[in-house]
């Protein structure tokens, strides 16, 4: 018979032959042959593989480093990685939660809508027209543009969401 060019789901092609993939939680020891099945071995204590695979090495479980404020939220298994979270009152810097911050800052152009608490991180909002923020801050709101008119001045340079307006003297009409 013709050697296969494609294999079924949960199989892989090797030496013109379809072999079974190893199930999650197990790694490949040896490919199948005409006479033997694929040989797989369970991952070790601190290892995992989360897909049907032909990997010869399992992945190490993630380490939740207490020096970075991390703790284990969910212990890893042979089929799943460890999930880290931050100590109470701290917040993950990313979805992967690789490190912790007390709270995040709002970038220039954004103001703080709500200051962080033990359970929720800083909530930022874009500065609307007429307001600006030129700093990165975890507490400062957007500031209103300076009103040149109330100072008997005129706008020399328009404001943006990151910069205040620049006021200047009014041009005096020559007689």
């Amino acid at each position: 018979p013709e050697p296969p060019t494609a294999c079924r789901e949960k199989q892989y092609l090797i030496n013109s032959q379809c072999c079974s993939l190893c199930q999650p939680g197990q790694k490949l020891v040896s490919d199948c042959t005409e006479f033997t099945e694929t040989e797989c071995l369970p991952c070790g204590e601190s290892e995992f593989l989360d897909t049907w695979n032909r990997e010869t090495h399992c992945h190490q479980h993630k380490y939740c480093d207490p020096n970075l404020g991390l703790r284990v939220q969910q212990k890893g298994t042979s089929e799943t990685d460890t999930i880290c979270t931050c100590e109470e009152g701290w917040h993950c810097t990313s979805e992967a939660c690789e490190s912790c911050v007390l709270h995040r800052s709002c970038s220039p152009g954004f103001g703080v809508k709500q200051i962080a608490t033990g359970v929720s991180d800083t909530i930022c909002e874009p500065c609307p027209v007429g307001f600006f923020s030129n700093v990165s801050s975890a507490f400062e709101k957007c500031h209103p543009w300076t009103s040149c008119e109330t100072k008997d001045l005129v706008v020399q340079q328009a404001g943006t969401n990151k910069t205040d307006v620049v006021c200047g003297p009014q041009d005096r009409l020559r007689a």
Partner: nanobody
Framework: EVQLLESGGGLVQPGGSLRLSCAAS???????EMWWVRQAPGKGLERVS?????????YYADSVKGRFTISRDDSKNTLYLQMNSLRPEDTAVYYC?????????WGQGTLVTVSS
Amino acid sequence: EVQLLESGGGLVQPGGSLRLSCAASGSTFAGYEMWWVRQAPGKGLERVSAISGSGGSTYYADSVKGRFTISRDDSKNTLYLQMNSLRPEDTAVYYCVKDPYSFDYWGQGTLVTVSS
């Protein structure tokens, strides 16, 4: 690597005052937003006060407004918290934290105990 060292804590009677200091070394201090946070025994972290990098803007938690004053001296790389009219509920370990607020920028804290 930045190091923050808090000092000035101690035992004080209700109604008394304390001035906490936070000395920063190993990193630029000027221009960075700074916070004082506290942790009472068996409680979570509470954000107490903050000061902008320029020193022009400040924030105070409602629980300390009118009693605490935050300030900074960039020439000395030091942050301060003047605490007046202290109450038993102000008892906590006080920490200063520097932008970007990562866990490894965390000092050892200074213990404030308000008790008669």
